[in-house]
């Protein structure tokens, strides 16, 4: 049976003080964007404050909750994509 390698798509966590976790061989996140000028151009907190928040996944900042969320890479799950799926 064909299955997506991970079915946990979006895990939202309300923790506002994530520990900085460095995982061996973890994919590097994108370079920090320059500070935008004017209204509505705030820097994405995922690129700085929450840079290492998602262990095996991509960080998305949920403005409404003022919190980071993680979309896990295939095979991983959990609020911070810290666990193997099986």
């Amino acid at each position: 049976d064909l299955q997506e390698a991970d079915l946990d798509l979006l895990r939202v966590t309300l923790s506002s003080k994530p520990q900085a976790l460095a995982t061996p061989n973890k994919e590097e996140h994108g370079k920090r964007k320059k500070k935008g000028k004017g209204l509505g151009k705030k820097r994405d907190p995922c690129l700085r404050k929450y840079k290492d928040f998602c262990i095996h996944g991509e960080c998305k900042y949920v403005k409404e909750l003022r919190a980071p969320s993680c979309i896990c890479h295939p095979g991983y799950h959990g609020e911070r994509c810290h666990g193997l799926s099986l």
Epitope: A5, L10, E27, H56, E58, C72, H73, P74, L84, L86
Partner: antibody, heavy 116, light 112 residues
Framework: EVQLQQSGPELMKPGASVKMSCKAS????????MNWVKQSHGKSLEWIGR????????SYSQKFKDKATLTVDKSLNTAYMQVNSLTSEDSAVYYC?????????WGQGTTLTVSS | EIVMTQTPLSLSVTIGQPASISCKSS???????????LNWLQQRPGQAPKHLMY???KLVPGIPDRFSGSGSETDFTLKISRVEAEDLGVYYC?????????FGSGTKLEIK
Amino acid sequence: EVQLQQSGPELMKPGASVKMSCKASGYIFTDYYMNWVKQSHGKSLEWIGRVNPNNGGTSYSQKFKDKATLTVDKSLNTAYMQVNSLTSEDSAVYYCARIYYGGSDWGQGTTLTVSS
Amino acid sequence: EIVMTQTPLSLSVTIGQPASISCKSSQSLLYTTGKTYLNWLQQRPGQAPKHLMYQVSKLVPGIPDRFSGSGSETDFTLKISRVEAEDLGVYYCLQGTYYPHTFGSGTKLEIK
């Protein structure tokens, strides 16, 4: 440096079973699945399955469900694959590999020869 | 399972000339992360496979930048800008979006 050290070559008789090993070092063993891949002589690579080092949970390709059994010993950072009911079709090089979203690391391969 | 169709089966290239290998998947490899988990591996004669590219176009550290990857959804290409003698071997694409993971049939690169 990530290293996957596999056990040596095996010469087995048809109908027998064989168990090969893969010892991992240089990374957190429980953070990544261990995958096993078959390569018959001069052929392409075939994904056999994967094992979760935390709890021994497995996922197999349909083709190898009744042929291979994947296990792990977390305390030894070692994964194992048992190949059952051997036939000449099972003669191949078997690789263990840490395949993940940011690349892969491979063992040197274990050559299995099945001959009467 | 996802079928990975690789072309050509073999390729004979003069040193210094470019080379291109194609890989097509039977289904889109785009995942919910917005990433596409398409990999390229090189297997030199008598050796274990070695990872070259991941997520379509990202070069594994230590791999020379004459290798590049491109494509999206179902169509992918590995390019070598200037082939060198050490590049001979078989090249495989590998999809990691779905289980079971599946490999292409391989492209044998020979030096003219």
